[in-house]
Interface confidence: low
């Protein structure tokens, strides 16, 4: 079976102040099984923004359908942006277990949120 | 204005190392991930490796993957490539790009160097 | 790895002509592709990024069209200086990244 790669082709993305970002995720294998999660910086300070399996998470909404069994789109809608959002946001694919373990991550994408224009 | 200066090539039997040099102006050299591209003769351009510009990431494309090294010295805003175990498929002129620091396309090159394994 | 493949291989046109230029990827790179123009004994030039955003300092009779796995570069009035080889390069899924086989673009 193919290696899971996890592609954020961007490195950084750009966003004014109220509008809506979008960060893009895919993956290259189905394989291991478990959940795709987002997160907002690294380390023990990282704040989760979006995981597969709980929710609501009112602001984000998914791509494409996550739900169906062969989705390898885990890109994410973040709708108005604040300064607060800045940072950067990785892609981490868990593998499914008593509790999920973190697999592999993206490279990370940078969120800059410009000042919402006059 | 964006400089890109690759030296280091040359004509070498196959087996043989070679260590090419890409010495960069004009940008901010540790923020920027550094790429080698190649072109054989008469061919098309062809993505040998990448490393981020914290020196802590590396990629390698298949063909050169456990005998190439690309490696970087920030303080001298310098990029290299180790070549070793050459072999006649390596001959190409060999190109330092720059990524855009937004995008993962090249945004400047290098004029090239010369790599030529011949026995 | 995501396979571009451009076509046709060699296109032979006059000056003033319109010149189109095809690239097809093997799976979508949604709008993550860019076009580089490369002459004799010079390295590649970029063109276009993002599929339809035009480098700095090049012509507007350059464009580029298409997002997933469809692409197109359009000169629309060659001129002396376009005559060359072109190349896209996909940098959606990486590594590697990968270069299409090129379109060379010759005075008929």
């Known amino acids: 079976e193919e290696e899971l790669q996890i592609i954020q082709p961007d490195k950084s993305v750009s966003v004014a102040a109220g509008e809506s970002a979008i960060l893009h995720c895919t993956i290259t294998s189905l394989f291991p099984v478990g959940p795709i999660q987002w997160f907002r910086g690294a380390g023990p300070a990282r704040v989760l923004i979006y995981n597969q399996r709980q929710g609501p998470f009112p602001r984000v909404t998914t791509v494409s359908e996550t739900t169906k069994r062969e989705n390898m789109d885990f890109s994410i809608s973040i709708s108005n942006i604040t300064p607060a959002d800045a940072g950067t946001y990785y892609c981490i694919k868990f593998r499914k277990g008593s509790p999920d373990t973190e697999f592999k991550s993206g490279a990370g994408t940078e969120l800059s949120v410009r000042a919402k224009p006059s | 204005d964006v400089q890109l200066v690759e030296s280091g090539g040359g004509v070498v039997r196959p087996g043989e190392s070679l260590r090419l040099s890409c010495a960069a102006s004009g940008f901010t050299f540790s923020s920027s991930d550094m790429n080698w591209v190649r072109q054989a003769p008469g061919e098309g351009l062809e993505w040998v490796s990448l490393i981020s510009g914290s020196g802590e990431i590396t990629y390698y494309a298949d063909s050169v993957k456990g005998r190439f090294t690309i490696s970087r010295d920030n303080s001298k805003n310098t990029l290299y490539l180790q070549m070793n175990s050459l072999r006649a498929e390596d001959t190409a002129i060999y190109y330092c790009?720059?990524?855009?620091?937004?995008?993962?396309?090249?945004?400047?090159w290098g004029l090239g160097t010369l790599v030529t394994v011949s026995s | 790895e995501t396979v571009l493949t451009q076509s046709p291989g060699t296109l032979s046109l006059s000056p003033g002509e319109r010149a189109t230029l095809s690239c097809r990827a093997s799976?979508?790179?949604?709008?993550?592709l860019a076009w580089y123009q490369q002459k004799p004994g010079q390295p590649p030039r970029l063109l276009i990024h993002?599929?339809?955003n035009r480098a700095a300092g090049i012509p507007d009779r350059f464009s580029g069209s298409g997002s997933g796995t469809e692409f197109t570069l359009t000169i629309s009035s060659l001129q002396s200086e376009d005559f060359a080889v072109y190349y896209c390069?996909?940098?959606?899924?990486?590594?590697?990244?990968?270069f299409g086989g090129g379109t060379k673009v010759e005075i008929k």
């Open positions: 993002a599929a339809r």
């Open positions: 799976q979508s790179v949604y709008t993550y």
């Open positions: 390069q996909q940098y959606y899924d990486r590594p590697p990244l990968t």
């Open positions: 790009a720059k990524e855009n620091n937004m995008y993962r396309f090249f945004d400047y």
